[in-house]
């Protein structure tokens, strides 16, 4: 039974606007038509789901309307963008990929991407 390797960058620095993007790439052992991608955040041994999307190969990645994630897919690569991040959101963001259909089912978990978020310094008041 083949394993499925998931690769993601080790470190990403969020922009000053609180946006972080990274690629989650999986080595598909089979010809999946339905794929589920989940992003989890691990901080202080606590794990929470950030967002998840199921998509059909060749179609757009669709997250829920209120999701902080957006993404696009291209072959076995998923380009993920997380928005609205603040310094307190710094943590390890884990990409989990599931090949849902057709059987057999495969699951792969990446090593995680450490996202660092630095809150921008407030602009100093100017005296005119």
């Amino acid at each position: 039974c083949k394993a499925m390797h998931v690769a993601q960058p080790a470190v990403v620095l969020a922009s000053s606007r609180g946006i972080a993007s990274f690629v989650c790439e999986y080595a598909s052992p089979g010809k999946a038509t339905e794929v589920r991608v989940t992003v989890l955040r691990q901080a202080d041994s606590q794990v929470t789901e950030v967002c998840a999307a199921t998509y059909m190969m060749g179609n757009e990645l669709t997250f829920l309307d209120d999701s902080i994630c957006t993404g696009t897919s291209s072959g076995n690569q998923v380009n993920l963008t997380i928005q609205g991040l603040r310094a307190m959101d710094t943590g390890l963001y884990i990409c989990k990929v599931e090949l849902m259909y057709p059987p057999p089912y495969y699951l792969g978990i990446g090593n995680g991407t450490q996202i660092y978020v630095i809150d921008p310094e407030p602009c100093p008041d100017s005296d005119f």
Epitope: S45, I109, G112
Partner: nanobody, 115 residues
Framework: EVQLVESGGGLIQPGGSLRLSCAAS????????MGWYRQAPGQGRDLVAH???????MYADSAKGRFTISRDNAKNTLYLQMNSLRPEDTAVYYC?????????WGQGTLVTVSS
Amino acid sequence: EVQLVESGGGLIQPGGSLRLSCAASGSISSYNVMGWYRQAPGQGRDLVAHIASNGEIMYADSAKGRFTISRDNAKNTLYLQMNSLRPEDTAVYYCKLWVLGNDYWGQGTLVTVSS
């Protein structure tokens, strides 16, 4: 190195119940997924169910209703409660552990359902 040791298999009559266990040891990431697969004679290895360290559970259609997966995170131990067993449940049951960037298999435990 991670090790998985399954136990609890054996010969059981149709309609009976069995509880499988899988003890994991070694370097295990705090986020992980543990699951059960089974392989019937001459067949491929199929997912039965899996459960993540944060409690998320997934069952294959064939396991819904009769099988219950659970885990003890403190002991890194996985369980599979199997009820109303049928002859077609006869298989080698394998434990699998997914950690960050890797996955591991146990050696398997044989379950035989026969009268």
